[in-house]
Interface confidence: medium
Amino acid sequence: AELFLIASPSHPTEGSPVTLTCKMPFLQSSDAQFQFCFFRDTRALGPGWSSSPKLQIAAMWKEDTGSYWCEAQTMASKVLRSRRSQINVHRVPVADVSLETQPPGGQVMEGDRLVLICSVAMGTGDITFLWYKGAVGLNLQSKTQRSLTAEYEIPSVRESDAEQYYCVAENGYGPSPSGLVSITVRIPVSRPILMLRAPRAQAAVEDVLELHCEALRGSPPILYWFYHEDITLGSRSAPSGGGASFNLSLTEEHSGNYSCEANNGLGAQRSEAVTLNFTVPTGARSNHLTS
């Protein structure tokens, strides 16, 4: 009696199941009690000897490529051996690599967590994912895993993380890069500093006083509000960041506390108060302002 090994499918793709069947065309396995064993190269597979002429392999991988055969043994201990069958496991090259961010859109608050998710639409086996920062490509990290997605995490985003990123996937057929993704790090404003600028050391009534408010950190645009005591004098915008100024024509009523507030939609911060006093110097006829 002759024995044949049949693999179904005969050209499996990585990750897919394969059924090995030990066939005896001129002998019904019911005619005699047979035990079956399947081999790859020199190693027995699965449970070893079994009464089933089939062996189900849940997932085949590239390294499972090899020469397979089966043996059948009767109760009388006669062993039949099939001819070897070469099974080549097919690897699908990676294709359509994309990079996505969490949070979506690539906008993240300073100090928050950023995840760069690299995905492939196609590809089997061990896929190496690599993440790069900047168009020049500083290699951040690599991961090799049997999945179509992998993640690179920045637990606490800093201002210096604002850059373009891309990822590359590779499973042996050459690297496939994703497109560039821009990351914007949104920074809440720091506490602003209020400075008073007068045309001379001792400003007089009717002089123009410049109130300059500046938050040293914070994502633009920044809106600045100016206050005398708790009365709003007005607002100024700094579309590209930096500070903003508000001009005031001085009168005697302008003595008191001044402050400013910076707001960029990620939180507001108020400056320390600056006090202005009108003084009358000895022998002088006009009022002067000191801060």
Epitope: H90, V92, P93, L130, Y173
Partner: antibody
Amino acid sequence: QVQLVQSGAELVKPGASVKVSCKASGYTFTRYWMHWVKQAPGQGLEWIGRIDPNSGGSKYNEKFKSKATLTVDKSTSTAYMELSSLRSEDTAVYYCTRVNSGAMDYWGQGTLVTVSS
Amino acid sequence: DIVMTQSPDSLAVSLGERATMNCKSSQSLLYSSNQKNYLAWYQQKPGQSPKLLIYWASTRESGVPDRFSGSGSGTDFTLTISSLQAEDVAIYYCQQYSNYPTFGQGTKVEIK
């Protein structure tokens, strides 16, 4: 431009070992797997094995498993192949080659290893 | 291993004429999952390294003249040089990369 520059020809005695180098430039070394191919005098091409420069993981043709050892030095973008227990039948030109789109798109100039007493 | 067999072993063609060579694999190199044939063609001139001409059986490598074309699917493949030039004198190898790479024995192209 992409270049793979191999070390010079070697004349070695039977039983000795030799280490062939392949310096890559013009591309990101860790992104492309490096393969090695043998060509005996007047013969065809024979695949030896490959290495992933990123992880250092390698795979070999069964025939060369006890003959060749593949390594990389990421800091210098250099791949190495060490051939051991050399015999006359190991006399050949050895090529390093980069793989892209499955195929070997760039090749080194080849290193002739001559085994003779 | 997948065995690659090339024919003919050598080929003499007049300048400007068509040169055709074949490559047969012991197993199919076409996979339904991505409809790709895992086959490449290389040119090797005397004293030089091999040069990639064609990959995925029919995709021409950049910089390769369009007189070179690859065709075929499954187990039978063809490399055609539509109009042979003097600089095309070389040995041409096919290679499969469905499994660990194996090469054909080569076809030598000469001028008649």
